[in-house]
Amino acid sequence: SGLNDIFEAQKIEWHEVPRWRQQWSGPGTTKRFPETVLARCVKYTEIHPEMRHVDCQSVWDAFKGAFISKHPCNITEEDYQPLMKLGTQTVPCNKILLWSRIKDLAHQFTQVQRDMFTLEDTLLGYLADDLTWCGEFNTSKINYQSCPDWRKDCSNNPVSVFWKTVSRRFAEAACDVVHVMLNGSRSKIFDKNSTFGSVEVHNLQPEKVQTLEAWVIHGGREDSRDLCQDPTIKELESIISKRNIQFSCKNIYRPDKFLQCVKNPEDSSCTSEI
């Protein structure tokens, strides 16, 4: 297969960093990280015709080049520029779904509503979803023992900078009506410190984006409150309005029914509020 050819051509040994080296507070690089990234790339480009011409070996070279031999607390967006370029992807800009603290439901939704896209439905998001990685300054080794934690060690680590960079580009590419799914069960439904609150909100382009529509997902079956009146949602509305983007909000009282109605919109029970 194509994947075997790639690894044959490389013949790279990914040594673990010896245990006596720098210990970070976070988990180490995901096992079989290079193989996983390459396998995901091959799979994605086979399934998505618009990305079929992408060379997964070049994608891996660009990914590797962003963090290998670099101090894992000194990574910049510029380090990821080659990967971002190779992963440039034209998704329908009016079909973008952002999410915050409710990834699983957002992904379940786009699996059903196939014409909408989360970041993880794009090549770059798909490659890195749920993975951890870091290297070590001046060696070509991947650190499988530990990687920097955003809070305890440093924010400019390979994983955090990747998601900041790719999230910014994803938001910049959005147009018309942009949707965001928010978790109504959390104390801060909108959190200014989340990737959505700190990156995506500020990179929506007012000249392209007309409206941000928030979907607040309720957790409890009996929860009939209007969470669109929550102070943090009002804060989001204020930030968005100041950026000359309109804001709207909807309560999704029953996420299970919501998904069911996305699957079967003709169902008679789907005309009532969900």
Epitope: V54, S58, D61, G65, L86, Q89, T90, C175
Partner: antibody
Framework: EVQLLESGGGLVQPGGSLRLSCAAS????????IIWIRQAPGKGLEWVAA?????????YYADWAKGRFTVSKDNSKNTVYLQMNSLRAEDTAVYYC???????????????WGQGTLVTV | DIQLTQSPSTLSASVGDRVTITCRSS????????LAWYQQKPGKAPKLLMY???NLASGVPSRFSGSGSGTEFTLTISSVQPDDFATYYC??????????FGGGTKVEIK
């Protein structure tokens, strides 16, 4: 001043090979994508290949160029090369190298171009 | 393959005329607006005029303007000057970092 200077063009037989050079000056070579673009006589522009090498070469190609054309870089000489093999009559063109604008807001556009070198097959 | 179609292929104009060139892409460009326009004079390399559909490149006169999004774009010269008689190319940026150019529009003196 940013300068790109192509060389190596000339007359070559069908099936032959040629290596073009693009010498760069006036900017930090490693921090930019260098793109090869060609223009057949009296025709439009067509991109060929791209290379970037802050740490190790990252390169990619137009679909039609894969296999026959190879882009490479010598950082010590501030030069990018385009190796062209199995040349055909339809490869006859002026070959330009261009520097892409820097920064993600400008990526995808070519701000600086060489004067071009003519390849005749 | 992505096709960028420019129209017209040739355009005759007099100094002071308003000129509009159209560029249509067979696929949406990246970010809905990742399209550039270049001007090329005989024997010379192209020169960047506009990027991201509507942004003027450095040093380009304000009589040039661009608009459009997705798959349809236009370049307008509000009042053609003698220096503007040249060939104009649109260029889109697409998935995987690939590029495509339009076939060109030659603006000639009427």
């Amino acid at each position: 001043e940013v300068q790109l200077l192509e060389s190596g063009g000339g007359l070559v037989q069908p099936g032959g090979s040629l290596r073009l050079s693009c010498a760069a000056s006036g900017f930090s070579f490693n921090n930019y994508w260098i793109i090869w673009i060609r223009q057949a006589p009296g025709k439009g522009l067509e991109w060929v290949a791209a290379i970037y090498s802050p740490s190790g070469d990252i390169k990619y190609y137009a679909d039609w160029a894969k296999g026959r054309f190879t882009v490479s870089k010598d950082n010590s000489k501030n030069t990018v090369y385009l190796q062209m093999n199995s040349l055909r009559a339809e490869d006859t063109a002026v070959y330009y190298c261009a520097r892409e604008l820097s920064g993600s807001a400008y990526e995808g556009y070519f701000e600086s171009w060489g004067q071009g070198t003519l390849v005749t097959v | 393959d992505i096709q960028l179609t420019q129209s017209p292929s040739t355009l005759s104009a007099s100094v002071g005329d308003r000129v509009t060139i159209t560029c249509r892409s067979s696929q949406s460009v990246y970010g809905h607006n990742w399209l550039a326009w270049y001007q090329q004079k005989p024997g010379k390399a192209p020169k960047l005029l506009m990027y991201r559909a509507s942004n003027l490149a450095s040093g380009v006169p304000s009589r040039f303007s661009g608009s459009g999004s997705g798959t349809e774009f236009t370049l307008t010269i509000s009042s053609v000057q003698p220096d503007d008689f040249a060939t104009y190319y649109c260029q889109g940026y697409y998935s995987g970092g690939s590029y495509a150019f339009g076939g060109g529009t030659k603006v000639e003196i009427k």
